[in-house]
């Protein structure tokens, strides 16, 4: 960056190089160039010469003043006009940053995705800080009182093998940057209660042409958890409102769920599961689209109806969606 250049003098910022966004700041430049009494001192921001709010303080020093500085990052340097020099002489440069102190981290959540071998902890970091902000995740065993700390810049994956202090823990998050530090409330967890079953996936759909056509959705999960509850939500793609069906599920075989849907309409389906009665749900699965067939026109010929019935006409779909929806709808 600009801070690596060789200086002939120095540049400094008041109140600091990293400051709260929206503050008034002063950038000072002091020349120390051999055989040069600067005629003029110039300031550059991101390579562009500043023309206003520059005050000469003395023979070697000038000040640039900014009101309500809102840029997250800027590279500043200053130059001198020396007598007998055709070009400006570089004095020094500095990278400056503005931003905000961190908000108190909230909505701290820790879950263990089945088979992952990790406890994943996330939180709502609050508003964007614009400056480098680090998070320390504290995990304290309620049985041994031992505390571990993990440094991260976003979420954290903690190997369950490293959680040797029993099943019950307190987890909290400290957020810190150059402008301040905040700490979340403590979350109490029990490792047995935060396991989220292996993802449920809709594999295919078919509409069977019976007297009343019905759509069968096939879905499965590789979970080994015995008591699993699931929700499947579905709607016409033109509709705003989801319909939700609930299931107590045994994943020893592929699930088949039946729906009586309107003909010739494109529907979207999603599924999610949880260990029955626990707090946390899987995120909703990828969007699965299925278009129901048009109604088979009524025909008077019994023979034709009989043939149609026997043909077991089906319309099948496979998953095409890759969008996922978060697990915060209905808390999750």
């Amino acid at each position: 960056g600009i801070t690596n250049i060789n200086c002939s003098g120095h540049i400094w910022v008041e109140p600091a190089t990293i400051f709260k966004m929206g503050m008034n700041i002063s950038i000072y430049c002091q020349a120390a160039i051999k055989n040069c009494q600067p005629r003029k001192l110039h300031f550059y921001k991101n390579g562009i010469k500043e023309r206003f709010q520059i005050t000469r303080i003395n023979k070697t020093t000038a000040r640039l003043w900014y009101k309500n500085f809102l840029e997250p990052h800027a590279s500043m340097y200053c130059t001198a006009e020396c007598p007998k020099h055709f070009q400006e002489t570089l004095i020094c440069g500095k990278d400056i940053s503005s931003g905000y102190p961190p908000d108190i981290p909230d909505e701290v959540t820790c879950v263990i995705y089945e088979y992952s071998g990790n406890m994943t902890c996330t939180w709502n970091a609050g508003k964007l800080t614009y400056i480098d902000t680090k998070y320390v995740v504290h995990v304290k065993s309620l049985e041994t009182e031992e505390e571990q700390q993990y440094l991260t810049s976003s979420y954290i994956n903690i190997s369950t093998d490293s959680l040797q202090g029993g099943k019950k823990y307190l987890v909290w998050v400290q957020a810190a940057n150059a402008l301040g530090m905040e700490e979340s409330k403590q979350l109490q967890i029990h490792l047995d209660d935060i396991v989220i079953p292996s993802a449920a996936v809709i594999s295919r759909a078919e509409t069977i042409n019976a007297t009343v056509p019905k759509t069968i959705i096939y879905w499965d999960s590789q979970t080994t958890i015995e008591k699993v509850s699931c929700e499947m939500r579905y709607k016409a793609t033109t509709n705003q409102t989801w319909n939700v069906k609930e299931f107590d599920t045994n994943f020893t075989y592929v699930q088949q769920s039946e729906f009586y849907l309107e003909p010739n309409i494109k529907y979207v389906f999603q599924v999610r599961c949880q260990e029955t009665g626990k707090r946390y749900w899987q995120p909703w699965s990828s969007l699965f689209f299925h278009k129901t067939p048009e109604t088979v026109p009524q025909v008077t010929s019994k023979a034709f109806q009989h043939d149609t019935w026997n043909s077991g006409l089906t319309v099948a779909s496979i998953s095409t969606g890759h969008l996922t929806s978060d697990n915060r709808g209905d808390i999750g």
Partner: antibody, heavy 117, light 107 residues
Framework: QVQLKESGPGLVQPSQSLSITCTVS????????VHWVRQSPGKGLEWLGV???????DYNAAFISRLSISKDNSKSQVFFKMNSLQADDTAIYYC???????????WGQGTTLTVSS | DIKMTQSPATLSVTPGDSVSLFCRAS??????LHWYQQKSHESPRLLIK???QSISGIPSRFSGSGSGTDFTLSINSVETEDFGMYFC?????????FGGGTKLEIK
Amino acid sequence: QVQLKESGPGLVQPSQSLSITCTVSGFSLTSYGVHWVRQSPGKGLEWLGVIWSGVSTDYNAAFISRLSISKDNSKSQVFFKMNSLQADDTAIYYCARSRGSYYFDYWGQGTTLTVSS
Amino acid sequence: DIKMTQSPATLSVTPGDSVSLFCRASQSISNNLHWYQQKSHESPRLLIKYASQSISGIPSRFSGSGSGTDFTLSINSVETEDFGMYFCQQSNSWPLTFGGGTKLEIK
């Protein structure tokens, strides 16, 4: 059939604590969460907290410092304790069942609490 | 916290009338909205889940609609047993919160 029944003291003095037991039948506490909700003329229905099918709990932040919920799965009982009661804690206290989705499909009949000296 | 506002506070109707009760959330809650009925001196009873899903054992004259912030509970041809309080509840974020209720009374 599914039933939840609260039993509480009826009258508690200010600054004292409240203990209510919710005894359930027709379902297992290892498969359902049990929530506590109170109802008063001044504040309407307020969600207080929940104990999930494991041992984890969640509390309304407004009550977290003085509330604790626990249970005994073998006795099908959930225990609610609230400390430092004041007159505005006077209400009907309900326990209610949820399956993991956060609505209440069965409620107890409620126990009326008056906080008064 | 998400604030749930119900309107009207009181609704006076004659048996046989069809009515609509309204619930508004202070921010979008998708369809994570549930309706309860509470008769005098009784505990609440779940009527509708997820804004529009019917509940086993609840008469078909009760229906729900809405998504986002605005929701409606409709009662098609009110019967005498329907009079009482109606509450909505959001389950989109902690803490779970209820509306202040609508009292359905006989005109």
